[in-house]
């Protein structure tokens, strides 16, 4: 996160860290807890690393440097990448992770509410992006979970800023015209959440941007409301019943 500040314990209890353990262990992406056994993240996090057993999912943590060999983590039972996601495109950058064992909810580990299907009428004015990603373009992973308040921008405005890309209705953009605050490398898959009527909702999944926090280059997020049917279908068909936070 560029231009952010340290988060507090329990402030974003749905935020998880997706880490890979090969020779060493490292944080690669963020994700959002949406049910006892489900994490929502970005499909591109698994490009080149589709093997379930190399991944470790840490929930209920604030500081990555607190993780030791004894820190509990979740393992993956199943990775469900959107069927229309292609490595050659930026579309449908969404994936579900089914955990091997369900998580108990605590003050520091609980799910985020999902939006209503096709939610286009709600005007969100209080939106935040969180993650342990770089604090500048050529930076490094941060130890303490960062947060930053960023306004949504219209898709029309976003398309003007990204003429060389197709900004679809299944994407949502956020950023300041002058730049300075944004998600960055390592924040992928993490949440863009907005507070509306006293409730936090998962509006976007951190997907991509041209650099980080550049002027007139907003961050682009997968619009969760556009994938509610897919999320419900996959979580229900895998579980028999949906085990996740009901849409707001």
């Amino acid at each position: 996160i560029v231009g952010g500040t340290n988060s507090s314990w329990g402030e974003w209890p749905w935020q998880v860290s997706l880490q890979v353990k090969l020779t060493a262990q490292r944080h690669l992406c963020g994700g959002s807890l949406i049910g006892h056994q489900w994490v929502l993240t970005a499909a591109h996090c698994f490009d080149g690393l589709p093997l379930q057993d190399v991944w470790r999912i840490y929930s209920g943590i604030l500081n990555l440097s607190d993780i030791t060999k004894d820190t509990p983590f979740s393992q993956i039972k199943e990775i469900i990448i959107h069927q229309n996601y292609k490595v050659s495109e930026g579309n449908h950058d969404i994936a579900l992770i089914k955990l091997q064992a369900p998580l108990n909810y605590t003050e520091f580990q609980k799910p985020i509410c999902l939006p209503s299907k096709g939610d286009t009428s709600t005007i969100y004015t209080n939106c935040w992006v969180t993650g342990w990603g770089f604090s500048k373009e050529k930076g490094e992973i941060q130890n303490i979970l960062q947060k930053v308040n960023i306004p949504l921008v219209t898709n029309e405005e976003c398309q003007k800023r990204y003429q060389d890309y197709k900004i679809t209705q299944r994407m949502v953009c956020a950023g300041y015209k002058e730049g300075g605050k944004d998600a960055c490398k390592g924040d992928s898959g993490g949440p863009l959440v907005c507070k509306h009527n006293g409730m936090w909702r998962l509006v976007g999944i951190t997907s991509w941007g041209e650099g980080c926090a550049r002027r007139e280059q907003p961050g682009v997020y997968t619009k969760v409301a556009e994938y509610m049917d897919w999320i419900l279908e996959k979580t229900q068909s895998s579980d028999g019943k949906a085990q996740m936070q009901s849409p707001a």
Partner: antibody
């Protein structure tokens, strides 16, 4: 299956004009940046021009700027290259290519993942 | 403009040998925008590597790419008969997009 098929090449005199076409199929053409690349006989590859998915943004190599115009018709899934004021040094095989732009570590990638078979343009008197 | 310099110009190797091709750029290139292509005579180029190190669909794992900044490498671990041809690196980090002049890999 992704396919790109160029046409319109041929022999033209110096100062003449030619319009190349590239018919695309097997993918959502309107979502992709498209590009032209050329290769003079026995030489390496040279990037010529690209056009944004909507067609509203175009960029050219200095060697063709002001003489060549790239365009597209998304309703016909076709890419074009209008070549005017042709010179002997424009003689080459012209390839159209799709520019794939995936996502890696919250940035986009950029690579020419599918190419046409090429069409030969010969500029000679 | 970003100049791309490939070396060596020609590489003469036997099947089964390892090929190491270098590509140096005159300015910093974001790795996400560095690709390698293979071209055999009479054929269109074929994408091998993108993002400096990711193999394109259907490319065998004997091909690998590495590098960062201004120094990039394509390695073919064990040459197969179908690997002979010309290899190009290309950047689309900044316009004008540019290719290297190519490295020809020929049978020794």
């Amino acid at each position: 299956e992704v396919q790109l098929l160029e046409s319109g090449g041929g022999l033209v005199q110096p100062g003449g004009s030619l319009r190349l076409s590239c018919a695309a199929s097997g993918f959502t053409f309107s979502h992709y940046l498209m590009t032209w690349v050329r290769q003079a006989p026995g030489k390496g590859l040279e990037w010529v021009s690209y056009i944004s998915p909507s067609g509203g943004h175009t960029i050219y190599a200095d060697s063709v700027k002001g003489r060549f115009t790239i365009s597209r018709d998304n309703s016909k899934n076709t890419l074009y290259l209008q070549m005017n004021s042709l010179r002997a040094e424009d003689t080459a095989v012209y390839y159209c290519a799709r520019v794939a732009r995936g996502i890696a570590a919250r940035s986009r990638t950029s690579q020419f993942d599918y190419w046409g078979q090429g069409t030969l343009v010969t500029v000679s008197s | 403009d970003i100049q791309m310099t490939q070396s060596p110009g020609t590489l003469s190797l036997s099947p089964g040998e390892r090929a190491t091709l270098s590509c140096r750029t005159s300015q910093f290139v974001n790795s996400n925008y560095l690709a390698w292509y293979q071209q055999t005579p009479g054929q269109a180029p074929r994408l091998l590597i993108y993002g400096a190190s990711s193999r394109a669909t259907g490319i065998p794992d004997r091909f690998s790419g590495t590098g960062y900044g201004t120094d990039f490498t394509l390695t073919i671990s064990r040459l197969e008969p179908e690997d002979y041809g010309t290899y190009y690196c290309q950047q689309s980090s900044r316009t004008p997009w540019t290719f290297g002049q190519g490295t020809r890999v020929e049978i020794k």
